[in-house]
C-alpha cells in the first residue's frame, strides 16, 4: 500500500496567524487612539495619569532590534490580558459620566479578546512556552470617585496605546524571522 492519505490544510498557519495578529493589533491601535481622543475631548486630562496595577511598558525603540519571538509574544499576551481585565473593570466600575463611551469600550474589549486568542493560537502552533497570565498586581476595587474612573480610563487607554504601538513594530520585525 502507498503512503497514508494526508490531512487537508486547516484555516491558517503560523505565518498567517502572525499576519492576522499584526492586522488585529493595527486595528486595535486605531480604535484605542480614537477612543483616547474622545476621552480627551469629553474629559480633558490634567497631565499624565497612571494606575499602579497597569503593566510597565515592555519595550522601547532602542530594544526593538534585539527582540526574540518567544519573549515578545509572551510579554505581549500577558500585558494585553492585563489591559483586557482593566477594560472589563472600567466598564463595570464606570460612573454615569463614562457610560456614554460604553459601546466603544465594549467593542475595544471584544477586539482585545480576539487578538489574545490569535496570539495564543500562534504560540500554540509554534510550541512556545505559554506563561499563565497573572491577575492584575493590585486588586481592582471601585474607583474612589467619578473623577477617579475618568483618570483610570485616561491611564488605561494611554498605556494600551503605547503597548499596541510597540506591539505592531515588534510583530512586524518578528515576521522577518519566522
Amino acid at each position: 500500500p502507498g503512503p497514508p492519505a494526508g490531512s487537508p490544510r486547516v484555516s491558517s498557519d503560523p505565518r498567517a496567524d502572525l499576519d492576522s495578529a499584526v492586522l488585529l493589533t493595527r486595528s486595535l491601535l486605531a480604535d484605542t487612539r480614537q477612543l483616547a481622543a474622545q476621552m480627551r475631548d469629553k474629559f480633558p486630562a490634567d497631565g499624565d495619569h497612571n494606575l499602579d496595577s497597569l503593566p510597565t511598558l515592555a519595550m522601547s525603540a532602542g530594544t526593538l532590534g534585539s527582540l526574540q519571538l518567544p519573549g515578545v509574544l509572551t510579554r505581549l499576551r500577558v500585558d494585553l490580558m492585563s489591559y483586557f481585565r482593566h477594560v472589563q473593570w472600567l466598564r463595570r466600575a464606570a460612573g454615569p459620566s463614562l457610560k456614554t463611551l460604553e459601546p466603544e469600550l465594549g467593542a475595544l474589549q471584544a477586539r482585545l479578546e480576539r487578538l489574545l486568542r490569535r496570539l495564543q493560537l500562534l504560540m500554540s502552533r509554534l510550541a512556545l512556552p505559554q506563561a499563565a497570565p497573572d491577575q492584575p498586581a493590585v486588586p481592582l476595587g471601585p474607583p474612589a470617585s467619578a473623577w477617579g474612573s475618568i483618570r483610570a480610563a485616561h491611564a488605561i487607554l494611554g498605556g494600551l496605546h503605547l503597548t499596541l504601538d510597540w506591539a505592531v513594530r515588534g510583530l512586524l520585525l518578528l515576521k522577518t524571522r519566522l
Epitope: 503560523p14 509554534l126 510550541a127 505559554q130 519566522l178
Partner: antibody, heavy 114, light 111 residues
Framework: EVQLLESGGGLVQPGGSLRLSCAAS????????MHWVRQAPGKGLEWVAV????????YYADSVKGRFTISRDNSKNTLYLQMNSLRAEDTAVYYC???????WGQGTLVTVSS | QSVLTQPPSASGTPGQRVTISCSGS?????????VHWYQQLPGTAPKLLIY???ERPSGVPDRFSGSKSGTSASLAISGLRSEDEADYYC???????????FGGGTKLTVL
C-alpha cells in the same frame, strides 16, 4: 496536502531503545511546533513531548522525562523521538503531530515486551 | 487519570443534538488557555475538529460547535449522523506541565 509519516516502531525488550522518525511534507515544517502523542491499546491520547518551531524549547510528560528525547532537523523536514530505558507501559501507537496539533500522522506501533 | 475530565460515553439518535463536556482546572482551561477538540474515527488517527474554543478548520461541518466558560468547555454536535460515531477528545495547554493535556475521551454512539 499535509503528510506526516512515522517510522521506526517495532518490538523491543524492556530496557531497550528505539528511535522514531516523522517525515513531514506539504507545509512549512520549520514554522510549526511538533509533538509526539501516544495511545496505548484501547486507551486515550497521552501527550509525550513537544519541540518548538526552531528547536529552542523542548518539554516532556513526567512519565517519559529523562528517558525520551525529542529533536528535529528543519533542513530535512524530519522530527525524531529517541526512546531509551523502555518499559512495558510505553507500549502504544506513537503519533507525530504538528501545531496545535492541527495535523496528525497515521502513527507507528511500539511494543515493549520480553 | 487524565488532567481534563470528560464523560466516558455519550449517545444520541440520528438528527439529535448531543453535548460533550470537558472539565479542567486553574492551570489549564481556567488560566484562559484555549480548548481544542479532536475526533478519532475507529482505527484512524485523531483529526482536529474545533480549535481556539469555537473555530472550525476548513472542511468541518457547522453541525460541530465549541464553547468555553470558566474551567469548562463543551462540544455540541447537532443533526447527529451515523458517521459521527467516534471518540472525541478535548485538549488545552497546561501551565504546570508546560505542554498540552488531553481529556480521557468520550465514545459517542449513534443509536
Amino acid at each position: 496536502e499535509v503528510q506526516l509519516l512515522e517510522s521506526g516502531g517495532g518490538l523491543v525488550q524492556p530496557g531497550g531503545s528505539l528511535r522514531l522518525s516523522c517525515a513531514a511534507s506539504g507545509f512549512t515544517f520549520s514554522s510549526y511546533g511538533m509533538h509526539w502523542v501516544r495511545q496505548a491499546p484501547g486507551k486515550g491520547l497521552e501527550w509525550v513531548a513537544v519541540i518548538s518551531y526552531d528547536g529552542s524549547y523542548k518539554y516532556y510528560a513526567d512519565s517519559v522525562k529523562g528517558r525520551f528525547t525529542i529533536s528535529r532537523d528543519n533542513s530535512k523536514n524530519t522530527l525524531y523521538l529517541q526512546m531509551n530505558s523502555l518499559r512495558a507501559e510505553d507500549t502504544a501507537v506513537y503519533y507525530c503531530a504538528a501545531g496545535v496539533p492541527d495535523y496528525w500522522g497515521q502513527g507507528t506501533l511500539v511494543t515493549v515486551s520480553s | 487519570q487524565s488532567v481534563l475530565t470528560q464523560p466516558p460515553s455519550a449517545s444520541g439518535t440520528p438528527g439529535q443534538r448531543v453535548t460533550i463536556s470537558c472539565s479542567g482546572s486553574s492551570s489549564n482551561i481556567g488560566s484562559d488557555y484555549d480548548v481544542h477538540w479532536y475526533q478519532q474515527l475507529p482505527g484512524t488517527a485523531p483529526k482536529l475538529l474545533i480549535y481556539s474554543n469555537n473555530e472550525r478548520p476548513s472542511g468541518v461541518p457547522d453541525r460541530f460547535s465549541g464553547s468555553k466558560s470558566g474551567t469548562s468547555a463543551s462540544l455540541a454536535i447537532s443533526g447527529l449522523r451515523s458517521e459521527d460515531e467516534a471518540d472525541y477528545y478535548c485538549a488545552a495547554w497546561d501551565s504546570s506541565l508546560y505542554g498540552p493535556v488531553f481529556g480521557g475521551g468520550t465514545k459517542l454512539t449513534v443509536l
